[in-house]
Amino acid sequence: KAMHVAQPAVVLANSRGTASFVCEYASPGKATEVRVTVLRQADSQVTEVCAATYMMGNELTFLDDSICTGTSSGNQVNLTIQGLRAMDTGLYICKVELMYPPPYYMGIGNGTQIYVIDPEPCPDSD
């Protein structure tokens, strides 16, 4: 069963290589457990960046070594991806699954193009 997922078209990472965006889903029912996955699409290859399952009212927790953090509020998930470099520029897709209660629903956003510009190294001072 398909579900609509909205996310911004473009986001620019800051100078520290951190990018944040909101992933919003139109829940057809009363979701109480949700799984959010961030996918990166580059050169027709899709790879999983990070994923988290959370119960409503509980914090959104990614694995300890994940480059993602996030918070949830209602049908919105605020995602932050850290440690990005220029080579990580690409389309980041938000996938949302309503895991519980049944029925299961899944939706995939159109993706957020994240642009990352490596900071210029500071010139040596004599």
Partner: antibody, heavy 120, light 112 residues
Framework: EVQLRQSGPELVKPGTSVKISCKAS????????INWVKQNHGKSLEWIGD????????NSNQKFEGKATLTVDKSSSTAYMELRSLTSEDSAVYYC?????????????WGQGTSVTVSS | DIVMTQAAFSNPVTLGTSASISCRSS???????????LYWYLQKPGQSPQLLIY???NLASGVPDRFSSSGSGTDFTLRISRVEAEDVGVYYC?????????FGAGTKLELK
């Protein structure tokens, strides 16, 4: 060791209410939904509903709406089910059970059951 | 509501032989995501139910590999390859494709 410890048997009069408890131990209480299931003496199982221990949000079987109220007390890791306006039809064994997401929300641990007998 | 149908009794089985228990659902439990939302529970005499199988064919932790389960979207079979005395009880199939979660009436496994 994961355990769900339920309160003892109840003998109650028709028209009254009863509140059953289910104390969880051996795991983080707020990480798992708690379900409640009815079993009419030796017969099949009926799902009553579930509760999210984080915020008290519930899903319920329409058949039991107005009959069963589910609550939790996070501080004591205890789930409760109150049954009201009791009739002989409510005489049964009631189980609490934990849902496990790794098993696609199957009930992986069950309480020992609480017998409720409604009789005048 | 999805109705789960089971026979009340299995054919009596001899210890060490195989047994099969059937279950039918009134609606396909195979979701478009490829998951079949079918579960098996065993209730031994005087005990609470215990989980055996989830997602139609996956064994829960601690369940002996003598148990296996298969099926289509609506017809399911639980098999016990070498029945032991401790396998006696009532076997329930259940679905959680949609609310309310529903159980079969249970099939009692009896020994010869």
């Amino acid at each position: 060791e994961v355990q769900l410890r339920q309160s003892g048997p109840e003998l109650v009069k028709p028209g009254t209410s009863v509140k059953i408890s289910c104390k969880a131990s051996g795991y983080k209480f707020t990480d798992h939904f708690i379900n409640w299931v009815k079993q009419n003496h030796g017969k099949s199982l009926e799902w009553i509903g579930d509760i999210n221990p984080n915020n008290g949000g519930t899903n319920s079987n329409q058949k039991f709406e107005g009959k069963a109220t589910l609550t939790v007390d996070k501080s004591s890791s205890t789930a409760y089910m109150e049954l009201r306006s009791l009739t002989s039809e409510d005489s049964a064994v009631y189980y609490c059970a934990r849902l496990r997401r790794e098993y696609f929300y199957a009930m992986d641990y069950w309480g020992q059951g609480t017998s409720v007998t409604v009789s005048s | 509501d999805i109705v789960m149908t089971q026979a009340a009794f299995s054919n009596p089985v001899t210890l060490g032989t195989s047994a099969s228990i059937s279950c039918r659902s009134s609606k396909s439990l195979l979701h478009s995501n490829g998951i079949t939302y079918l579960y098996w529970y065993l209730q031994k005499p005087g005990q609470s139910p215990q989980l055996l199988i989830y997602q139609m064919s996956n064994l829960a932790s601690g369940v002996p590999d003598r148990f296996s389960s298969s099926g289509s979207g609506t017809d399911f079979t639980l098999r016990i390859s070498r029945v032991e005395a401790e396998d006696v009880g009532v076997y329930y199939c259940a679905q959680n494709l949609e609310l309310p979660l529903t159980f079969g009436a249970g099939t009692k496994l009896e020994l010869k």
